[in-house]
């Protein structure tokens, strides 16, 4: 805690200037008034303050706005943002995008912090939902942002905002998220032509079942062996070797180079190798010939 | 071109008096807050005295507190240190340098090259 | 005021080498730490800032880490436009205040 002491005659700040980095930490909380700041809080930005200085400024915030700051002051906070705690920014009401942006490119550069984590979810909550325009701007500081929501929070995002989703932002997102987002991509995606709506959908692909696999190898697609070992085993699994092939076009020859990965190996292993040996790439593990294949799920499902 | 080039430096005897020049060029010199800072021999850097853009703010190291005066001409583009009561623990090279702020924090942006004063009878 | 002690005032090394600048300050500066480079009779040259972040032109061979109290500046591969004397300065607290200084020079 600073000491209350009177401001010395002739320091009283009659303004937020770069005057009051020459002031110790009692004169600025002697100094400054903190209706004053508030007022002036877009010039804090520009000034070099020192670390203490900031801190004496906030607790000055602090002190105005106990229940929380109003949103005209934290559009200005500029660097001081970064002094804030979670716990300060669970009292704000963020509404303006822009404000959100204003913040975030304060900490750009930098990893996600807990205050900007705690920003965004009350941004987010205070919205509803993840719109366009927020997904738009957190991706852009944050590439990876999508893949950090839980399935839970992916299922509040509006199909319309996967416009916004660029094929980085998707790196690092497990299955059970694109699970989430695929439906999503689809429907977003669904007015588009052939080639086109692969190139957009082609990111989202390690939620997709079967059904859409078997789908997209009819139209020519050239799936490339990345995006093919991204796929979920289970809707690898029952392509036939003419539709993996139709699938990967050119690309089927990496196959090979994949043969002991997944989904790859799991997929030979449920192939007869006499298909397998179609394909003229020397992969095998197949199921041999005059072998019966019994679907066991199948017959559970049956019984 | 950002520039700083101090003058003024030279032999002074002990209870005497200089006045050091630092012209700046290549920024808006009344923006930005200023400072002296000295490296005396062998030693490391010390601040001395600063001065906001306006010059309606100073603040001064302990160590010459009643004995320096900091001050600026805008229109010259040029700061200023008068130097009184010299001792020889004053000997040093004096530097000017600019305050900016980089991602937040604060830093000394821009120097000039030095003035050296050697305090000495 | 905080005081800033560099370690080692001075060193000897060779073109390649990788080398290592420490400074300790007497209280906590969370990570309000600058470092400067001064080549003899020139400027000194604000280097690394905020303890990490490399000002613009600086190059990538130089790094710095650390946090609280105890900071080091890092050159991977020492060139010959490296020699220099680096200083830290604490931002954290008014006044500014520098260690004092380490002299890198040819082995």
């Known amino acids: 805690e600073v000491e209350k002491t009177a401001c010395p005659s002739g320091k009283k700040a009659r303004e937020i200037d770069e005057s009051l980095i020459f002031y110790k930490k009692w004169e600025l909380e002697a100094c400054v008034d903190a209706a004053l700041l508030a007022t002036q809080m877009d010039r804090v930005n520009a000034i070099p303050f020192t670390y203490e200085q900031l801190d004496v400024l906030k607790h000055k915030l602090d002190e105005l706005y106990p229940q929380g700051y109003p949103e005209s002051v934290i559009q200005h906070l500029g660097y001081l943002f970064l002094k804030m705690s979670p716990e300060d920014i669970r009292k704000w009401n963020v509404t303006s995008l822009e404000t959100l942006k204003a913040l975030l490119e304060v900490n750009k550069g930098h990893e996600m912090s807990p205050q900007v984590a705690t920003l965004i979810d009350r941004f987010v909550k205070g919205r509803g939902q993840l719109d366009k325009d927020t997904l738009d701007t957190l991706t852009a500081f944050y590439p990876g942002y999508l893949c950090s929501l839980s399935p839970e929070e992916l299922s509040s995002v509006p199909p319309s905002s996967i416009w916004a989703v660029r094929p980085q932002d998707l790196d690092t997102c497990d299955p059970r998220q694109l699970d989430v987002l695929y439906p999503k991509a689809r429907l977003a995606f669904q007015n588009m032509n052939g080639s086109e709506y692969f190139v957009k959908i082609q990111s989202f692909l390690g939620g997709a079942p079967t059904e859409d696999l078997k789908a997209l190898s009819q139209q020519n697609v050239s799936m490339d062996l990345a995006t093919f070992m991204k796929l979920r085993t289970d809707a690898v699994l029952p392509l036939t070797v003419a539709e993996v092939q139709k699938l990967l076009g050119p690309h089927v020859e990496g196959l090979k180079a994949e043969e002991r990965h997944r989904p790859v190996r799991d997929w030979i292993l449920r192939q007869r190798q006499d298909d397998l040996d179609t394909l003229g790439l020397g992969l095998q593990g197949g199921i041999p010939n005059g072998y019966l294949v019994l679907d066991l799920s199948m017959q559970e499902a049956l019984s | 071109e950002v520039q700083l080039v101090e003058s003024g430096g030279g032999l002074v005897q002990p209870g005497g008096s200089l006045r050091l020049s630092c012209a700046a060029s290549?920024?808006?010199?009344?923006?930005?807050?200023m400072s002296w800072v000295r490296q005396a021999p062998g030693k490391g850097l010390e601040w001395v005295s600063g001065?906001?853009?306006?010059?309606?703010?100073?603040g001064y190291a302990d160590s010459v507190k009643g004995r320096f005066t900091i001050s600026r001409d805008n229109s010259k583009n040029t700061l200023y240190l008068q130097m009184n009561s010299l001792r020889a623990e004053d000997t040093a090279v004096y530097y000017c340098?600019?305050?900016?702020?980089?991602?937040?924090?604060?830093?000394?942006?821009?120097w000039g090259q030095g003035t050296l004063v050697t305090v000495s009878s | 005021d905080i005081q800033m002690t560099q370690s080692p005032s001075s060193l000897s090394a060779s073109v390649g080498d990788r080398v290592t600048i420490t400074c300790r300050a007497s209280?906590?500066?969370?990570?309000?730490l600058n470092w400067y480079q001064q080549k003899p009779g020139k400027a000194p040259k604000l280097l690394i800032y905020?303890?990490?972040r490399l000002q613009s032109g600086v190059p990538s061979r130089f790094s710095g880490s650390g946090s609280g109290t105890d900071f080091t500046l890092t050159i991977s591969s020492l060139q010959p436009e490296d020699f220099a004397t680096y200083y830290c300065?604490?931002?954290?607290?008014?006044?500014?205040?520098f260690g004092q200084g380490t002299k890198v020079e040819i082995k």
């Open positions: 340098a600019k305050h900016g702020q980089v991602g937040g924090i604060s830093v000394f942006d821009i």
């Open positions: 290549g920024f808006t010199f009344s923006s930005y807050a």
């Open positions: 001065i906001s853009g306006s010059g309606g703010s100073t």
């Open positions: 209280q906590s500066i969370s990570n309000w």
């Open positions: 905020a303890t990490s």
């Open positions: 300065q604490q931002s954290y607290s008014f006044p500014w205040t």
